[in-house]
């Protein structure tokens, strides 16, 4: 299953598949997913080790039990890869890293005023993967705010060093944030030309692409197809780059064919795993073990819930059959492609499933009319689980926020639905950050149920928590996405960046906003909390956020919309906008619903109707 | 310029037989996975059969297994269905399709013939 | 197998409209997804392969976009010989299935 959690002074002992420089644990565990062996990963932050040629070391494992011994070591981070791990797999990595120069071929030098410019330069060229920025007041004056487009053979730095006034981070392509845009079509009998950088065995051109899309080099590819007059060569799938991005030629050949990654798509990335069925195929590989299974499909499952598994040839010979089940042949390679590929066979074969991140059905735990005052425009994808609760009458309007759990629920404040009940007259968006890109032709989600906590009451701020089962579930990519939930009872964890967001008003009498909103908001103590509401009180099932000061806040049409921490990487949803005194004034908190204290409530209502639950413990 | 042609349809008694042909130009025939899809009389359409391109490997719609028989001749250029036990719920215009790339099974159809009308009844 | 359920099942527009149909499949086929156009009396023409393909030959009118369960055909702008019934279709495994069609009428 999945495990997400991290193991602090700890490393693995042994399992090396391959290292590298990473800027943090994060981007460490995201290169292990994606590593067709790695299980574990072991990273050593710059603080942890005198040897300078191991800072910010990312040591990818494998483990044919899945674990590894872990010795002590001071400031090591380790932890497991995210392969089924459903939603969590991601490619994205946004971070920008401050007093980090991460090295690489500098190919590209520009002046720009900001490392935001300088990371959206690098996300529109098609070559760069990472990029560094000297600020303005960087000791050199000559190199203040250059912008340094990078690329290396493996797509991570080939070394990181601590540097005052540079700031790194990178590419965002793998977000679908470029603007280049992507060639969608597949050419037919036609090779390209240029530098090879990876040859694969693949059973079709469209999993070539995917694989073409996720390695960090390839820019297009050809794939020689399974009646190539050469027949050591069938099914290569050939990964190439060049120096222009683009092929600089392109031959007419029968049986090959051509085509481009998908990197550099706008909004829309394929999945990095392959779904598809290959009847009269075998896969050829490293056997990992054989089971008899009652169906194709069920042996593509058993491969996806074997985590080493890689891909799998489900055989119907007679002498692999017996009753109703046949041998199912779970394999792996080194690379994570099929060693030789068969045809005409009385098997079927496919993929593991265990990077796809449509994940199971599940949502994600781990083991008074409140907009946000004093915020900054989100970007797209930045919160991929807020989502819009319109309601249209005649006209339609914005009401809240909420939250996407799962394929099909959305976790919002109860007062929502304050004399608003009907589940017909919502409509609810997802994937969206401007309200003014809603048109007639936007597709929405409608409301199967609402489920408004028993104990809530109109008017009291107690309970004002509800969950509401959309008609369909809706499918996960980049930019719709759920949060994960806390633990039961979570209140160990000490959250220090906490973040509000939503459309609402940005004063007190103000107006709905078109761009999402954000704004980071330290959490209160509920003894401070109660100190600043005393006609009011603030129980142990309530969290509370915001400045002395005042200045920031969420405020009228944020209700029912998140509160998220980030804590070891990961985002939680820790409260639901709920309450507060106006908004963003001095000494009064924005009051917020306690999500880790209605665990075991969301737990039951998001039960199947086979009684099976819909949640999933990454833990 | 890819052309595909079928003939063999007509109307045949329930419990009887016919063989459908399709003969195909205007590109490498043997290099392509090829399809009979259906579509019965103001209905949607239906997979029916597939065949890869050496002729090696078939599939078959649960509702026609063990009654139809895919078939090419890639000296011929030509796809087969052969149909026998013929049902009332087989009427229906039969398209030949050919694979849209040249791979084991694409499952996309870029090219399909004018079709052929099987009448089955008493 | 794998069910695949269009929706509207027909649609009445003017020419120059945006027509949006969408396809649902009853379980993720990732991007194995086509639609195909047919007018009366004549055989399926394939528009869009693997959900936003563009068939050669097609104007670029028509694009696909969709991943997993729920996929979209889209015709920009309505032209008279966009009039037909239109298909969506799973090649993610056998058996191959596909909608039961969407009519575009003319209001």
């Known amino acids: 299953g999945c495990l997400t959690q991290l193991y602090e002074n700890a490393f693995f002992r042994g399992g090396d598949v391959a290292s590298m420089y990473t800027p943090n644990a994060q981007y460490c565990q995201m290169r292990c997913t994606f590593h067709p062996r790695c299980l574990l990963f072991s990273f050593l932050p710059a603080s942890s080790i005198n040897d300078m040629e191991k800072r910010f070391g990312c040591f990818l494992k494998d483990s044919v039990t899945g674990t590894l011994p872990k010795v002590h070591r001071t400031g090591a981070v380790s932890g497991h890869s995210l392969k089924q791990c459903g939603h969590q797999i991601s490619a994205c990595h946004r971070d920008i890293y401050k007093g980090v120069d991460m090295r690489g071929v500098n190919f590209n030098v520009s002046k720009v005023s900001s490392v935001e410019e300088c990371q959206k330069r690098c996300t529109s060229n098609i070559r760069c993967q990472f990029f560094s920025y000297a600020t303005q007041t960087f000791h050199k004056a000559e190199y203040r705010n250059n912008c340094l487009l990078k690329y290396s053979p493996g797509g991570t730095p080939t070394a990181i060093k601590v540097l005052s006034n540079v700031e790194s981070g990178f590419s965002l392509k793998p977000c679908a944030l470029s603007e280049i845009g992507c060639h969608m079509n597949i050419f037919q009998h036609l090779a390209f030309s240029d530098v090879d950088v990876a040859r694969v065995l693949t059973p079709d051109a469209f999993v070539c692409r995917t694989i073409c899309t996720y390695h960090p080099n390839c820019l297009f590819f050809t794939f020689y197809t399974n009646v190539w007059k050469i027949e050591s060569q069938r099914n290569v799938c050939l990964l190439k780059t060049s120096e222009s991005g683009t092929p600089s030629s392109s031959t007419p050949q029968e049986n090959t064919i051509s085509g481009y990654s998908l990197l550099t798509c706008k909004r829309t990335l394929p999945e990095p795993c392959h779904s598809k069925i290959y009847p009269g195929v075998d896969f050829g590989g490293e056997e990992l073990n054989v089971t008899f299974v009652k169906g194709v499909n069920v042996c593509q499952e058993t491969c996806t819930k074997m985590i080493r598994c890689q891909f799998f040839t489900y055989s119907l010979l007679p002498e692999d059959c017996k009753e109703e089940k046949c041998k199912c042949f779970l394999r792996l390679s080194m690379d994570g492609s099929p060693t030789r590929i068969a045809y005409g066979t009385q098997g079927s074969s496919g993929y593991s499933l265990r990077l796809c991140n449509t994940g199971d059905n599940s949502v994600c735990t781990t083991k008074t009319s409140t907009r946000i005052v004093g915020g900054t425009n989100s970007s797209w994808g930045e919160w991929p689980w807020q989502v819009s609760l319109q309601v249209k009458l005649t006209a339609q309007r914005h009401l809240c926020g909420g939250s996407l759990i799962g394929h099909q629920w959305v976790l919002t404040a109860a007062h929502c639905f304050d004399g608003l009940p009907l589940q017909d007259v919502w409509r609810i968006y997802s994937g969206i950050l401007n309200l003014s890109d809603i048109t007639k032709d936007t597709p929405f989600s409608q409301i199967k149920e609402i489920i408004i906590h028993q104990n809530y009451k109109v008017s009291e701020g107690n309970h004002d928590i509800a969950l509401i089962k959309l008609q369909a579930p809706l499918n996960y990519t980049e930019f719709q996405k759920p949060i994960c939930l806390p633990s039961k009872g979570d209140t160990s964890t000490i959250y220090t960046n906490c973040w509000v967001t939503g459309w609402g008003f940005s004063k007190e009498k103000g107006e709905i906003q078109n761009i999402l909103q954000k704004v980071n908001i330290p959490l209160v103590t509920n003894e401070e909390c109660q100190k600043r509401y005393q006609d009011y009180k603030i129980t142990q099932r309530m969290v509370c956020a915001g400045y002395k000061e005042g200045g920031k806040d969420a405020c009228k049409g944020d209700s029912g919309g998140p509160l998220v921490c980030k804590h070891n990487g990961m985002w939680r949803l820790v409260g639901i906008t709920s309450w507060g005194e106006g908004c963003a004034r001095r000494e009064q908190p924005g009051v917020y619903t306690k999500v880790a204290e209605y665990m075991d409530w969301i737990l039951e209502k998001t039960q199947s109707s086979d009684g099976k639950a819909q949640m999933q413990s990454p833990a | 310029e890819v052309q595909l042609l079928e003939s063999g349809g007509g109307l045949v008694q329930p419990g009887g037989s016919l063989r459908l042909s399709c003969a195909a130009s205007?590109?490498?025939?043997?290099?392509?996975?090829m399809y009979w899809v259906r579509q019965a009389p103001g209905k949607g359409l239906e997979w029916v059969s597939s065949?890869?391109?050496?002729?090696?490997?078939?599939l078959y719609a649960d509702s026609v297994k063990g009654r139809f028989t895919i078939s090419r001749d890639n000296s011929k250029n030509t796809l087969y269905l052969q149909m026998n036990s013929l049902r009332a719920e087989d009427t229906a215009v039969y398209y030949c399709?050919?694979?849209?790339?040249?791979?084991?099974?694409?499952?996309?159809?870029?090219?399909w013939g004018q079709g052929t009308l099987v009448t089955v009844s008493s | 197998d794998i069910q695949m359920t269009q929706s509207p099942s027909s649609v009445s527009a003017s020419v120059g409209d945006r027509v949006t149909i969408t396809c649902r499949a009853s379980?993720?086929?990732?991007?194995?997804l086509a639609w195909y156009q047919q007018k009366p009396g004549k055989a399926p023409k394939l528009l869009i392969y693997?959900?936003?393909g563009l068939q050669s030959g097609v104007p670029s009118r028509f694009s696909g976009s969709g991943s997993g369960t729920d996929f979209t055909l889209t015709i920009s702008s309505l032209q008279p010989e966009d009039f037909a019934t239109y298909y969506c279709?799973?090649?993610?495994?056998?058996?191959?299935?596909f909608g039961g069609g969407t009519r575009v009428e003319i209001k």
């Open positions: 379980q993720g086929i990732s991007s194995w």
């Open positions: 205007g590109f490498t025939f043997s290099d392509y996975t």
């Open positions: 693997a959900t936003s």
């Open positions: 065949i890869v391109p050496s002729g090696g490997h078939t």
């Open positions: 399709a050919k694979d849209h790339l040249s791979s084991w099974y694409g499952g996309f159809f870029d090219y």
């Open positions: 279709q799973q090649a993610k495994s056998f058996p191959l299935t």
